[in-house]
Every structure is written in structure tokens, then in C-alpha cells.
């Protein structure tokens, strides 16, 4: 927790709240993250195969950021998703997209972030992924790509 | 603060936030900011030669946009950075970053944003700055470039 | 809400938050806001022709996203501005904006997306509101263009 | 059909200061950057400023930079060039030009004002 | 900063001739460079952008080409409302001028 160890616990409630930043090693989708070690927290919601689960229904505000680069620009199209899963509903929810497309000039190096957040009603035991649509573009670096949210 | 007197003081503690704007005499990193005039507000956090200043330990949502433009499109790598300091600790911490490469034109006029938000577990006494990798390629309207927190 | 009824009321005092979602009929400025189907949130806080209006005093963040995109880059600058209303003053505010400038290749298929968010102090009857400088190059999907808000 | 016309050119001491201005039409004038150009008699061509738009950006070169400040008012279609601390060596034939869809060229010109800085 | 240096400085030519007027760029400046004439009294008149790409409404006589440092345009049939002087500007880093090239009657 930046370098803190984290506060000492209150007698208040346990406040819900996770950031997760990017783990090098993911290999297929949705994305996997560092959950333990650098600037990393995770309080009060369990983080499973990818996915932040919920473990208290209310509002929570969730957000993503996913640095992508690469060697030499071809403008493949490059999507960000943060979506919802519940075993209750068949289809995974798309909660927030980003998508960019001809955002760099070919044979170039190139970078671009792609940022998301915003406000949803959760569910206990709804699962939250981020997916990407070129992982090999995706720089990990915990400052760079991560996965967060916190309950109102 | 958005041309309104700001809030009654109520009971409650007062509630640690943070909205700073740009300041175009900035000169040097980390930015500067403007912290008494404007769309400005400073509750609970001091302002110290750039940076917010942690006064309760806690979680904080922190967030900045940086917007960059230019006249004559280059391509120079640009970067935006919050980071921590604090003097317990040797090293500042990187927090957050964007970096964009190949994002314009050659030769066009340009402008891009880069935004940054996530939380995090601060400590009393942290100080956070704001750094960019060229000054001159920064606009600093009020609206356009910033940087804040507030305490969950 | 993400398919979820709403949590069942608290005797604690109702939150206050907004997410609304892109209306693909959108026809002039403002933008126009999906307020009741989908993945929207609508509570302690009214919407009313384009506009989230503020009912308590207090402090909120704020945030918005859009989505363009186009069928032939032309390089038209595009402009997302969230700014406030209210009717003891003249002049609309700017609290945040976002500009984009030869961000894609001329001639081909593109899309970029504009991310603002922040704190602001809001005083009851404030309206907010999002604006767009190209109408026609924004795409309304709910996961793409949204904007939002809750009181801290 | 396109049109932008300079005025308020004159002699002026070193030192003083003048104000220029350009009132454009037969274009949406708040869609496009306008430069400043200037050209000293019998000589070439020297770009002076630019303004965005929306009037949000300016950019100026070296030679001018802190003395001259570049504006535009969208709502009257005109844009405006205010020299202060003038030298012998900004007198020049003053052009206004429309930049060509934000690439630094520029597509059409004015027909220029004379300021001459003399004592 | 780029400098941009024309030559020849003046070119004597009678009507009908085939005229070359040469640009360089003190350093790379891919194809963005524009030309411009410019006639005593008056101001510049837009013609090619992109170092070959002519504006509409100039004559087809008119061309450009080049591309790094080396730029011409080319008078295929000189005309007698064509002499005038001619000015390069590159618009790849910045805004630069050449010192112009005035093209008289011989």
C-alpha cells in the first residue's frame, strides 16, 4: 500500500475497496492481476481468476486504465471492457467500453491509454473482469494498467 | 468553488477534499497549481509548493488530467505522472501514469488529454505531485488541467 | 440497474448519484441522456432535458465519457465539455473539458474516446450538462457514452 | 466567396503600442486558426502568430513573443493582433491568412496593413 | 529550427518556357511543404500543398514535387499573369519561409 502498512482496523465497518494493477504474466482473457505485492488493495471484496467479486450489494464507483503500446504502429483496433458476471444471468454485462481505432501513424512506436469509470448498482456475488482485445499490446507496469472500485 | 460560498460547516468532521487547477507561470516540475481562485477547493489537505499535502491517514481517490497540445505536431513522448513522496522513505513513488507516443500528425496542429484516477491507501505526511514530461506543451485552463482527491 | 432491482431502501438518508447512458436521438446541444432503461441509476438527484440537477448542497464528483468515432478521419476538432447552469447566474461554467486535434489518420475509419472527472462543490438547483462539439461523430452506446455523478 | 481585411496600421513611435484587427466572411470564421503574417518591405515572408479556433491556444514566434498577443472575438467574426513595446524592425506589411484544416499552410490571405515604426 | 533556402534567388524566362524553382530543407521535412506566389502590392496566392498536391483553381500547369529535403516547382508553360515571386513553407516542424524566388520577363 504504497509503501504503508494499512491503517489500523476501526470499529467502523470494513470499507469495500480494491486496486489491482497489472500482472505481466496474463495470458488469455479476461485479465488477470497482481492482488498481493506494490500498490495494491483489496479490502472487503475477494479477487477471484480475474475478477473482483462482490460481496455487499449497493453503489459502487469502478474504474480501469490499460496502457497499450507497441513497436511499430499498424492501428489494429484496441478495445478496453469492464464487464459483469453473474451466474444468475446468462450474458456477461458490458459495464464501460473503450475502443480505439487509426490513433497512431503506421511504423511508428507507439502508446495510448484508455481510461473508464463510473457508477454502477451491484450485487453480491456479481464478478467484475476487464478484457482487452490485444494483450500482446498491453504494457503491465503496476502505475500503468489497473483494476479498481470502491463502495459508496 | 464553482461560484458558490462554500457549504455550511456542519458537525461532522470536515470532510478532506481536494480540486486544483492549473497554473500557466508554472516553470519547473513537479506542476504547480492554483489552489485560491476559480473552480478551486482545498478542505482537510494543505497545498505546499505543488503538491497535496496528507494530513489523516486513510483512503483517498485520487485523480489528475493533464491537457497537452502544441502548434506544430512533433510527436515528442509525453507523460504524465502522480506521484508520492514522503520523507520516511528514500525513492518517490510512481502512482500513476499515462504516456503517449505517436498520437499526432506530423506537422498539424494537436491536442490531447491524458486522465488518471484510482485509489489509494495514503499515509499523513504523503505528499503527492503532479509531473509532466514538457511543460511547454501543457494547457493549463481550469477546466482542461488539474489535479484532486478526496478522502472516501 | 446492471439487471439488479435496486437495494432495498435504507433507513439511513438516500444517496445521491446519477449514471445516465448515451440516447441515440440526441439532436441538438446538450446531449440527452438515457434515464430509465439499461444500465442507468437515477437517485436524490433529477433529470431534466439534458440536464442532472443538483437538489442538495454539497460536494460531488463528477464524470463523463464519450465516445467518437467516424467513417473517414477528417482531423474535425472535437471538444466534450461537462458545465453548469443555474439561473442566479449569466454565464454557463466550464468544470471540466476535454479537446482532441489530429488524433487519427486522414482518410481512415477511427474512433478515440474523451474521460472527465472531478470534484465539485454543487449548490442545490445547479444543472449539469454535457456538450459535444460534432453530434454525428458520437456513438450513444450505453457502455460507451455515459455521465454521472455522486454526492461524497 | 472568402474574404479577410486587415486595418488599424499607421506609424508608430518605438516603443508604442498598436492594435490590429481582421474582419473576415464568407466562412464560418469560428471553425478555423488564423494566422498573423508579416513581410518587411522588400522582403520575405515571416509568420508572426496563430490562434485556435476557438480561441483556447496561441503560439507565437520568438521575435514577437511577449510583446504581441494574439486574439479573436468569434461572436463579430474578427481577429486582432496588439503589439506593444514596438521596434523599427516589426515594420512590415501585416497579413491575416486562414489556416488550411489546422495544417500551418494557409489558404487564403488579406490584403495587408502597412505599420511603420518610426521616430 | 528549419531553415528553407530557394534557388535560383531571381530566373529570367520568356513566355512559354518550362521553368524549375528549387526548395531545400535544412533537415528532413517528409512532404510538408507549400508554395505561394506573390505578385508586387498584393498578397500571397495559395498553390500546392504537400509538396504536390495542387490547390483548386491553379492552373494545371503548375506542379510540385519532392520530398525530405529537395522540393520543385515546376512552370510546365509559362504564362504572362505567371511572373511574380514565389515563396516555399514548410509546415513540418513549426512555420518557415524560403526568402522567395522572383521570376522577371527576359
Known amino acids: 500500500q504504497i509503501g504503508h502498512p494499512s491503517p489500523p482496523p476501526e470499529k467502523k465497518e470494513q470499507r469495500k475497496v480494491a486496486h489491482l494493477t497489472g500482472k505481466p504474466n496474463s495470458r488469455s482473457m479476461p485479465l488477470e492481476w497482481e492482488d498481493t505485492y506494490g500498490i495494491v488493495l483489496l479490502s472487503g471484496v475477494k479477487y477471484k481468476k480475474g475478477g473482483l467479486v462482490i460481496n455487499e450489494t449497493g453503489l459502487y464507483f469502478v474504474y480501469s486504465k490499460v496502457y497499450f503500446r507497441g513497436q511499430s504502429c499498424t492501428n489494429l483496433p484496441l478495445s478496453h471492457k469492464v464487464y459483469m458476471r453473474n451466474s444468475k444471468y446468462p450474458q456477461d454485462l458490458v459495464m464501460m467500453e473503450g475502443k480505439m481505432m487509426s490513433y497512431c501513424t503506421t511504423g511508428q512506436m507507439w502508446a495510448h491509454s484508455s481510461y473508464l469509470g463510473a457508477v454502477f448498482n451491484l450485487t453480491s456475488a456479481d464478478h467484475l473482469y476487464v478484457n482487452v482485445s490485444e494483450l500482446s499490446l498491453v504494457n503491465f507496469e503496476e502505475s500503468q494498467t489497473f483494476f479498481g472500485l470502491y463502495k459508496l | 468553488q464553482i461560484g458558490h460560498p462554500s457549504p455550511p460547516p456542519e458537525k461532522k468532521e470536515q470532510r478532506k477534499v481536494a480540486h486544483l487547477t492549473g497554473k500557466p507561470n508554472s516553470r519547473s516540475m513537479p506542476l504547480e497549481w492554483e489552489d485560491t481562485y476559480g473552480i478551486v477547493l482545498l478542505s482537510g489537505v494543505k497545498y505546499k509548493k505543488g503538491g497535496l499535502v496528507i494530513n489523516e491517514t486513510g483512503l483517498y481517490f485520487v485523480y489528475s488530467k493533464v491537457y497537452f497540445r502544441g502548434q506544430s505536431c512533433t510527436n515528442l513522448p509525453l507523460s504524465h505522472k502522480v506521484y508520492m513522496r514522503n520523507s520516511k522513505y528514500p525513492q518517490d513513488l510512481v502512482m500513476m501514469e499515462g504516456k503517449m507516443m505517436s498520437y499526432c500528425t506530423t506537422g498539424q496542429m494537436w491536442a490531447h488529454s491524458s486522465y488518471l484516477g484510482a485509489v489509494f491507501n495514503l499515509t499523513s505526511a504523503d505528499h503527492l505531485y503532479v509531473n509532466v514530461s514538457e511543460l511547454s506543451l501543457v494547457n493549463f485552463e481550469e477546466s482542461q488541467t488539474f489535479f484532486g482527491l478526496y478522502k472516501l | 440497474q446492471i439487471g439488479h432491482p435496486s437495494p432495498p431502501p435504507e433507513k439511513k438518508e438516500q444517496r445521491k448519484v446519477a449514471h445516465l447512458t448515451g440516447k441515440p436521438n440526441s439532436r441538438s446541444m446538450p446531449l440527452e441522456w438515457e434515464d430509465t432503461y439499461g444500465i442507468v441509476l437515477l437517485s436524490g438527484v433529477k433529470y431534466k432535458k439534458g440536464g442532472l440537477v443538483i437538489n442538495e448542497t454539497g460536494l460531488y464528483f463528477v464524470y463523463s465519457k464519450v465516445y467518437f468515432r467516424g467513417q473517414s478521419c477528417t482531423n474535425l476538432p472535437l471538444s466534450h465539455k461537462v458545465y453548469m447552469r443555474n439561473s442566479k447566474y449569466p454565464q454557463d461554467l466550464v468544470m471540466m473539458e476535454g479537446k482532441m486535434m489530429s488524433y487519427c489518420t486522414t482518410g481512415q475509419m477511427w474512433a478515440h474516446s474523451s474521460y472527465l472527472g472531478a470534484v465539485f462543490n454543487l449548490t442545490s438547483a445547479d444543472h449539469l450538462y454535457v456538450n459535444v462539439s460534432e453530434l454525428s461523430l458520437v456513438n450513444f452506446e450505453e457502455s460507451q457514452t455515459f455521465f454521472g455523478l455522486y454526492k461524497l | 466567396q472568402v474574404q479577410l481585411v486587415e486595418s488599424g496600421g499607421g506609424v508608430v513611435q518605438p516603443g508604442r503600442s498598436l492594435r490590429l484587427s481582421c474582419a473576415a466572411s464568407g466562412f464560418t470564421f469560428s471553425t478555423y486558426g488564423i494566422h498573423w503574417v508579416r513581410q518587411a518591405p522588400g522582403k520575405g515572408l515571416e509568420w508572426v502568430a496563430v490562434?485556435?479556433?476557438?480561441?483556447?491556444?496561441?503560439f507565437y514566434a520568438d521575435s514577437v513573443k511577449g510583446r504581441f498577443t494574439i486574439s479573436r472575438d468569434n461572436s463579430k467574426n474578427t481577429l486582432y493582433l496588439q503589439m506593444n513595446s514596438l521596434r523599427a524592425e516589426d515594420t512590415a506589411v501585416y497579413y491575416c491568412a486562414r489556416d488550411r484544416d489546422n495544417w500551418n499552410y494557409f489558404d487564403y490571405w488579406g490584403q495587408g496593413t502597412l505599420v511603420t515604426v518610426s521616430s | 529550427d528549419i531553415q528553407m533556402t530557394q534557388s535560383p534567388s531571381t530566373l529570367s524566362a520568356s513566355v512559354g518556357d518550362r521553368v524549375t524553382i528549387t526548395c531545400r530543407a535544412s533537415?528532413?521535412?517528409?512532404?510538408?511543404l507549400a508554395w505561394y506566389q506573390q505578385k508586387p502590392g498584393k498578397a500571397p496566392k495559395f498553390l500546392i500543398y504537400?509538396?504536390?498536391s495542387l490547390e483548386s483553381g491553379v492552373p494545371s500547369r503548375f506542379s510540385g514535387s519532392g520530398s525530405g529535403t529537395e522540393f520543385t516547382l515546376t512552370i510546365s508553360s509559362l504564362q504572362p499573369d505567371d511572373f511574380a515571386t514565389y515563396y516555399c513553407?514548410?509546415?513540418?516542424?513549426?512555420?518557415?519561409f524560403g526568402q522567395g524566388t522572383r521570376l522577371e520577363i527576359k
Open positions: 490562434i485556435w479556433y476557438d480561441g483556447s491556444d496561441k
Open positions: 533537415q528532413s521535412i517528409s512532404s510538408w
Open positions: 504537400q509538396a504536390s
Open positions: 513553407q514548410q509546415y513540418n516542424s513549426y512555420i518557415t
